[in-house]
């Protein structure tokens, strides 16, 4: 039995997979910030987690996926105040009783030190300093990401 949030996450991911292939992204769009091989958009408004998920999808992006602690720290360095919370693409899967990224992978327990409960209707937010489990219905800001396409160096013959 999937929760409504899990269904929403799966539906959006499937609809994204059905879309036609777009050319790779070489530069970040206006208002997006580059962080290594990603473009990040920090919202100024607030939403519950599932609305945030949907908003990123409409922007042809996804809620932020964090690979490791290093990426977390670099992302947190872009947050300007300690009293701002941002949703990321991680929520509690009731069926699998584990934290699950919206791309279907499970959280490696060493990646993020989550403060708070792992239970139904819990979603993950980040602040300038920490990672929190919050109720998914809470209206806070969110971070969307787009992957940048790596540009391979072309070798030109001498002219």
């Amino acid at each position: 039995q999937k929760s409504s949030i899990e269904k929403c996450s799966v539906d959006i991911q499937q609809s994204r997979n059905k879309t036609t292939e777009r050319p790779g992204l070489l530069n970040c769009p206006i208002y997006w910030q580059q962080l290594r091989e990603k473009c990040l958009l920090f919202s100024h408004t607030v939403n519950p987690w599932n609305n945030s998920l949907a908003d990123c999808s409409t922007k042809e992006s996804s809620l932020l996926l964090i690979r490791d602690k290093d990426e977390l720290i670099h992302t947190q360095n872009l947050i300007r105040d300690k009293a701002i919370l941002f949703w990321i693409g991680l929520n509690f899967s009731l069926s699998e009783k584990n934290w699950k990224w919206i791309n279907g992978s499970f959280l490696n327990s060493n990646d993020l030190e989550i403060r708070g409960d792992a239970k139904e209707n819990s979603c993950i937010s980040i602040s300038q300093t920490s990672v929190y489990s919050e109720y998914c219905s809470t209206e806070i800001r969110w971070i969307c990401q787009k992957e940048l396409t790596p540009v391979r160096n072309k070798v030109y013959p001498d002219s």
Epitope: V46, A83, L85, R115, G116, S127, S133, E134, T138
Partner: antibody
Framework: EVQLVESGGGLVQPGGSLRLSCAAS????????MSWVRQAPGKGLEWVSA????????YYADSVKGRFTISRDNSKNTLYLQMNSLRAEDTAVYYC????????????WGQGTLVTVSS | DIQMTQSPSSLSASVGDRVAITCRAS??????LNWYQQKPGKAPKLLIY???SLQSGVPSRFSGSGSGTDFTLTISSLQPEDFATYYC?????????FGQGTKVEIK
């Protein structure tokens, strides 16, 4: 209807302690950040502390950091403020208010509870 | 910390008057500015959030404008129940700070 009702105020000696409570009803308490805001007699409003919906994240004004602790019990729909090492300048009406994480406004307020610190 | 400065500190006006209260931030706060009304012995009440959005249930004679550092609360036609103290507050950065208040009195 959203309601916030504070209690626990009173007269306390300098250096003493007091715990304020705020009972919330009419909304999904656990989904909202909450704050304490105070107002000294005849003065303006001063934000004191805030806590996230889950209670995992808290922050404080410099004037109370290390002396006051904000907490919440979502099963009881109640917000708390534990006040230790009280000073005369802490004398004020203490309001609990919904909101406090950026960019929230304080959209609902309790009626306030008076804390008097005096010997 | 961001300082919020209101002017005037107090004003006298008559019923039906148009009243404007200004609030200046010590640095840019974009549109993260809220206005509250407080009557003696009562809790503050949110009137305007995000500089210009009217809180639900608040009469349309109240309006807010501005962005960056300069903001204005306007009461288009003062009513007897509007005599109170008004506070601005920034929700751009911590600590959250309020203006010192503007008392609107009966002339």
């Amino acid at each position: 209807e959203v309601q916030l009702v504070e209690s626990g105020g009173g007269l306390v000696q300098p250096g003493g302690s007091l715990r304020l409570s705020c009972a919330a009803s009419g909304f999904t308490f656990s989904s909202y950040a909450m704050s304490w805001v105070r107002q000294a007699p005849g003065k303006g409003l001063e934000w004191v502390s805030a806590i996230s919906g889950s209670g995992g994240s808290t922050y404080y004004a410099d004037s109370v950091k290390g002396r006051f602790t904000i907490s919440r019990d979502n099963s009881k729909n109640t917000l708390y403020l534990q006040m230790n090492s009280l000073r005369a300048e802490d004398t004020a009406v203490y309001y609990c208010a919904r909101g406090g994480y950026l960019p929230d406004a304080f959209d609902y307020w309790g009626q306030g509870t008076l804390v008097t610190v005096s010997s | 910390d961001i300082q919020m400065t209101q002017s005037p500190s107090s004003l006298s006006a008559s019923v039906g008057d148009r009243v404007a209260i200004t609030c200046r931030a010590s640095q840019s706060i974009s549109s993260y500015l809220n206005w509250y009304q407080q009557k003696p012995g009562k809790a503050p009440k949110l009137l305007i959030y995000a500089a210009s959005s009217l809180q639900s249930g608040v009469p349309s004679r109240f309006s807010g404008s501005g962005s960056g550092t300069d903001f204005t609360l306007t009461i288009s036609s003062l009513q007897p129940e509007d005599f109170a103290t008004y506070y601005c507050q920034q929700s751009y950065s911590t600590p959250l700070t309020f203006g010192q208040g503007t008392k609107v009195e009966i002339k």
